[in-house]
Interface confidence: medium
């Protein structure tokens, strides 16, 4: 039985697939944006010294009650090796610098597209 149409493939998802799916989700968010994303909520800007995915998750996890980014939050947690919870504030953030969630998602999407194009899947 080599073909199991409609079933999830067994074993871990390849990094390239996970990254492509995250990109696709961010594309969906940016394209389907009617009203201001997450009611114009602001998130901390990030620096990358301890890993982009964890930093992005730490920023977005503090946005509550926004169903549009819940799937993104779950997907990012799959890329981050440690547990991230709301209220965490680490060196991954740029203090006193907040931007709108919509801008953050757009920036993250462009960066991930670049990584995908360059074959950097981890």
């Amino acid at each position: 039985l080599t073909c199991l149409g409609g079933f999830a493939s067994p074993g871990p998802v390849p990094p390239s697939t996970a990254l492509r799916e995250l990109i696709e989700e961010l594309v969906n968010i940016t394209q389907n944006q009617k009203a201001p994303l997450c009611n114009g909520s602001m998130v901390w800007s990030i620096n990358l010294t301890a890993g982009m995915y964890c930093a992005a998750l730490e920023s977005l996890i503090n946005v509550s009650g926004c169903s549009a980014i819940e799937k993104t939050q779950r997907m990012l947690s799959g890329f981050c090796p440690h547990k991230v919870s709301a209220g965490q504030f680490s060196s991954l953030h740029v203090r006193d610098t907040k931007i709108e969630v919509a801008q953050f998602v757009k920036d993250l999407l462009l960066h991930l597209k670049k990584l995908f194009r360059e074959g950097q899947f981890n």
């Epitope: 800007s45 990030i46 620096n47 990358l48 010294t49 982009m52 930093a55 740029v94 931007i99 801008q103 953050f104 920036d107 993250l108 462009l110 960066h111 597209k113 670049k114 194009r117």
Partner: nanobody, 119 residues
């Protein structure tokens, strides 16, 4: 709203040094390549240097290689250009520019800061 604000320009003697800064806001600074571009009086734009996320690798025009150093501090959303062994031909308005991740072209510019190298 994306904003880039350069500072640090001025008058310096040949052989001297200057450090330019560019304060960025309105976007996730850490995720983008950032560049310095200059325009000498009566001349066109000339690319000077580019730095990638996390600060490595960096790229330089041949005309400044070994004399200029680009750096960034993502914790301060700030881009820098350390300019040493300045020459008269380095006289220009220096612009900080954000590089679009996919198109690989400059999509936002600062207002520029003037560097004059003269004795």
């Amino acid at each position: 709203e994306v904003q880039l604000l350069e500072s640090g320009g001025g008058l310096v003697q040949p052989g001297g040094s200057l450090r330019l800064s560019c304060a960025a806001s309105g976007f996730t600074f850490a995720l983008y390549d950032m560049s310095w571009v200059r325009q000498a009086p009566g001349k066109g734009l000339e690319w000077v240097s580019t730095i990638t996320p996390l600060g490595s690798p960096t790229y330089y025009a041949d005309s400044v290689k070994g004399r200029f150093t680009i750096s960034r501090d993502d914790s301060k959303n700030t881009l820098y250009l350390q300019m040493n062994s300045l020459r008269a031909e380095d006289t220009a308005v220096y612009y900080c520019a954000k590089v679009h991740s996919v198109e690989n072209e400059f999509d936002y510019w600062g207002q520029g800061t003037l560097v004059t190298v003269s004795s």
